[in-house]
């Protein structure tokens, strides 16, 4: 065609896949009458007539474009709907009169790829691989034209590097004409890459300009040999007997080696393997002072059979021995003096305290307690506490009972007990003294005696309330080698008038339980009196 060499560059029309391309015939009125135009598509330099305009009316030609073309803008523009990648070609309009002229339009088609799908090597990468290994893949599906991929490590783009970094990209054409890009990042990794963040970026163009999509960031499992093995003890800080102590082996390799924990035998100085749990942890529970000693860990790489030994670690389980008090069972006369001495061993400095057992009152800070001018009331329990101030909770105690010679001493001299006739009463009487007294009752009934402590005794008596008993009352007598003493229990009949708010309070330690003789015992203390029976 004459003058074809001077053809101007085609007009560029850019459109996204699936949208409508507006192909405006740019012939001027002098070049041709737009009411008489032929439209062609050019593919591989072959022209195909696709649309005719006659007297401003359009008509599609049979073929691939038949259903997708229509006229717009009073016949000057051809609209192509549902654009596909296959539509990327030159379209031309040709005016017929006054002379044959043509106008060329280059249609460019774009489609953003899907979000890149990044996948990491599921088996991981050893640092000593001979060749660069497949680290990760990046797939960008259904883009047009082919997007460009850039790999990043820790936010920096990765460049091809001989024998170190190799990026292998390939693409496949889907039946839709869209491209799927697969990029494989091959690299020789180093130990420091275990924390590296990798991602890929797809760069693509749309009619609106350049765009990019980033994958999620991934880390790669990196395998590297162990260089160092060490022991870790939990809890950290001072350990004491009774604690749960965990000794574990750690290594700086991935995967970690096979661990074993040994303790040095103090007598043979040989290392003896300890039994660990399934996780390779040596659990000492409860920890004892015998667990103290020198521990070390061995890490064995099962691939190379190389064995590494940790620095030995000294473990100290702090303890306090049994506490000894002397004298162990002191007996003294009233008015005399007594010195109590407390001893114990420990892995740390000890602090001693003496406490009164009954009250918890601190009597002395130190291992020696001196008691002068002993009274009967001074008899009873004294506790020595040996503790390690630097280790909270590490202490041992010993109780010593001080006996003061003396006749029985009653918990109460006399008391009133509310009763009902024909009830079984449960009476109690308490006495103390040294030697420990025994208790007897002045009435028949079922009595039982209970030793409360070395100097104290409690006797309980079950007895039926009779008119005679009401008259005589009940006495309990406590006796030992040094004398005797008596407590009196006055029995008072319950009637409605005696049930005043104050009448049911008594003093002392005695409890009385009243129940009808004809019924099974129902136990109640004096503070809650039984309901009086209505006598009809």
């Amino acid at each position: 065609v004459p003058g074809e060499a001077e053809q101007p560059a085609p007009e560029l029309v850019e459109v996204e896949v699936g949208s409508t391309a507006l192909l405006k015939c740019g012939l001027s009125q002098s070049q041709g009458n737009l009411s008489h135009v032929d439209w062609f598509s050019v593919h591989k330099e072959k022209r195909t007539l696709i649309f005719r305009v006659r007297q401003g009316q359009g008509q599609s030609e049979p073929g691939e474009y038949e259903q997708r073309l229509s006229l717009q803008d009073r016949g000057a523009t051809l609209a192509l709907t549902q654009v596909t990648p296959q539509d990327e070609r030159i379209f031309l309009c040709q005016g017929k009169r006054p002379r044959s002229q043509e106008y060329r339009i280059q249609l460019r088609v774009y489609k953003a790829p899907e979000e890149p799908n990044i996948q990491v090597n599921p088996l991981g990468i050893p640092v000593n691989s001979k060749e660069p290994e497949e680290v990760a893949t990046c797939v960008g599906r259904n883009g047009y034209p082919i997007p460009q991929v850039i790999w990043y490590k820790n936010g920096r783009p990765l460049k091809e590097e001989k024998n170190r970094v190799h990026i292998q990209s390939s693409q496949t054409v889907e039946s839709s004409g869209l491209y799927t890009l697969q990029s494989i990042l091959k690299a020789q990794l180093v130990k420091e890459d275990k924390d590296a963040q990798f991602y890929c970026e797809l760069n693509y163009r749309l009619p609106s300009g350049n765009h990019m999509k980033e994958s999620r960031e991934v880390t790669v499992p990196v395998f590297y040999p162990t260089e160092k093995v060490w022991l870790e003890v939990e809890p950290v800080g001072m350990l004491k007997e009774g604690d749960r102590v965990e000794i574990r082996c750690l290594a700086d390799g991935n995967p970690p080696p096979h661990f074993s924990i040994s303790k040095q035998n103090p007598s043979t100085r040989e290392a003896e393997e300890e039994t660990t749990n399934d996780n390779g942890v040596l659990v000492l529970e409860p920890a004892r002072k015998e667990h103290s000693g020198r521990y070390e860990c061995q890490g064995l790489d099962l691939d190379t059979m190389i064995s590494l030994l940790s620095e030995p670690q000294e473990l100290l389980v702090n303890y306090v021995s049994d506490v000894r008090v002397s004298p162990a069972a002191p007996e003294r006369q009233e008015g005399s003096s007594l010195t109590l001495t407390c001893e114990a061993e420990s892995s740390q400095d000890l602090e001693f305290q003496w406490l009164r057992e009954e009250t918890g009152q601190v009597l002395e800070r130190g291992p020696v307690l001196q008691l002068h001018d002993l009274k009967r009331e001074a008899g009873g329990g004294y506790r020595c506490v040996a503790s390690v101030p630097s280790i909270p909770g590490l202490n041992r105690t010993q109780l010593v009972n001080v006996a003061i010679f003396g006749p029985p001493w009653m918990a109460f001299k006399e008391r009133k007990v509310w009763v009902k006739e024909n009830m079984v009463l449960n009476l109690s009487c308490e006495a103390s003294g040294h030697p420990r007294p025994t208790i007897s009752w002045n009435v028949n009934g079922t009595a039982s005696e209970q030793d409360q402590d070395p100097q104290r005794v409690l006797s309980t008596l079950n007895v039926l309330v009779t008119p005679e008993l009401l008259e005589t009352g009940v006495e309990c007598t406590a006796s030992n080698d040094l004398g005797k003493n008596t407590s009196i229990l006055f029995l008072e009949l319950v009637n409605l008038t005696t049930l005043t708010p104050d009448s049911n309070t008594t003093t002392g330690l005695s409890t009385s339980t009243a129940s009808p003789h004809t019924r099974a015992n129902s136990t109640s203390t004096e503070r809650k009196l039984p309901e009086p029976e209505s006598r009809g």
Epitope: N117, Q119, N121, P122, L123, E131, E133, E134, K186
Partner: antibody, heavy 116, light 106 residues
Framework: QVQLKESGPGLVQSSQTLSLTCTVS????????VSWVRQPPGKGLEWIAA???????YYNSAFKSRLSISPNTSKSQVLLKMNSLQTEDTGMYFC??????????WGQGVMVTVSS | DIQVTQSPSLLSASVGDRVTLNCKGS??????LAWFRLKRGEAPKLLIY???SLQTGIPSRFSGSGSGTDFTLTITSLQPEDVATYFC????????FGAGTKLELK
């Protein structure tokens, strides 16, 4: 086209060593990794070991101490050795090609019976 | 280790049926999941990779979907030759397979 074929003894005595060979064609062992997978009778598939295109070896930790995988690149073969065989090791053994992380082509498998 | 649970273990369907097989990961595996068909005496065949990509040469009646922990293999119109055992496999961390779904004709 891509092909993989497993070969090895059909019957092995317990406590003995099993040697299996995977012969590949249509691709190179320097461009694709290969895995071994087994299927005990009436059970599911279980990954055993792999060798990467770069020559790195990987093992299922359940078998690690008794496995060895190695390539013979010139013969396009991957060899699997499993020692201390037990009757539970009876099953169909497959080799499969990596592309690069999923398995796109498999062999037909070889049946291995471990007799006591 | 990542566990993969397949359901159902047995499925009976008729020719032409739409069939759905499920696979569940014990943790997020993104799209690192493949589906295989296993027939006695044949090499296992890859159907779907990357959760939803159809392997070359596999009929378009097969499709995969899902991401994260829940995945599905769908056969839109069951054919007699589809009778087989189907396995899913995760390749996010190591390689583990589901126990399989045996698909049979009613």
């Amino acid at each position: 086209q891509v092909q993989l074929k497993e070969s090895g003894p059909g019957l092995v005595q317990s406590s003995q060593t099993l040697s299996l060979t995977c012969t590949v064609s249509g691709f190179s062992l320097t461009s694709n990794g290969v895995s071994w997978v087994r299927q005990p009778p009436g059970k599911g598939l279980e990954w055993i070991a792999a060798i990467s295109s770069g020559g790195s070896t990987y093992y299922n930790s359940a078998f690690k101490s008794r496995l060895s995988i190695s390539p013979n690149t010139s013969k396009s073969q991957v060899l699997l050795k499993m020692n201390s065989l037990q009757t539970e090791d009876t099953g169909m053994y497959f080799c499969a090609r990596h592309r690069p992380f999923y398995f796109d082509y498999w062999g037909q498998g070889v049946m291995v019976t471990v007799s006591s | 280790d990542i566990q993969v649970t397949q359901s159902p273990s047995l499925l009976s369907a008729s020719v032409g049926d739409r069939v759905t097989l499920n696979c569940k990961g014990s943790q997020n595996i993104y799209k690192s999941l493949a589906w295989f068909r296993l027939k006695r005496g044949e090499a296992p065949k890859l159907l779907i990779y990357d959760a939803n990509s159809l392997q070359t040469g596999i009929p378009s009646r097969f499709s995969g979907s899902g991401s994260g922990t829940d995945f599905t293999l769908t056969i839109t119109s069951l054919q007699p030759e589809d009778v087989a055992t189907y396995f899913c496999q995760q390749y996010y961390s190591g390689y583990t397979f589901g126990a399989g779904t045996k698909l049979e004709l009613k």
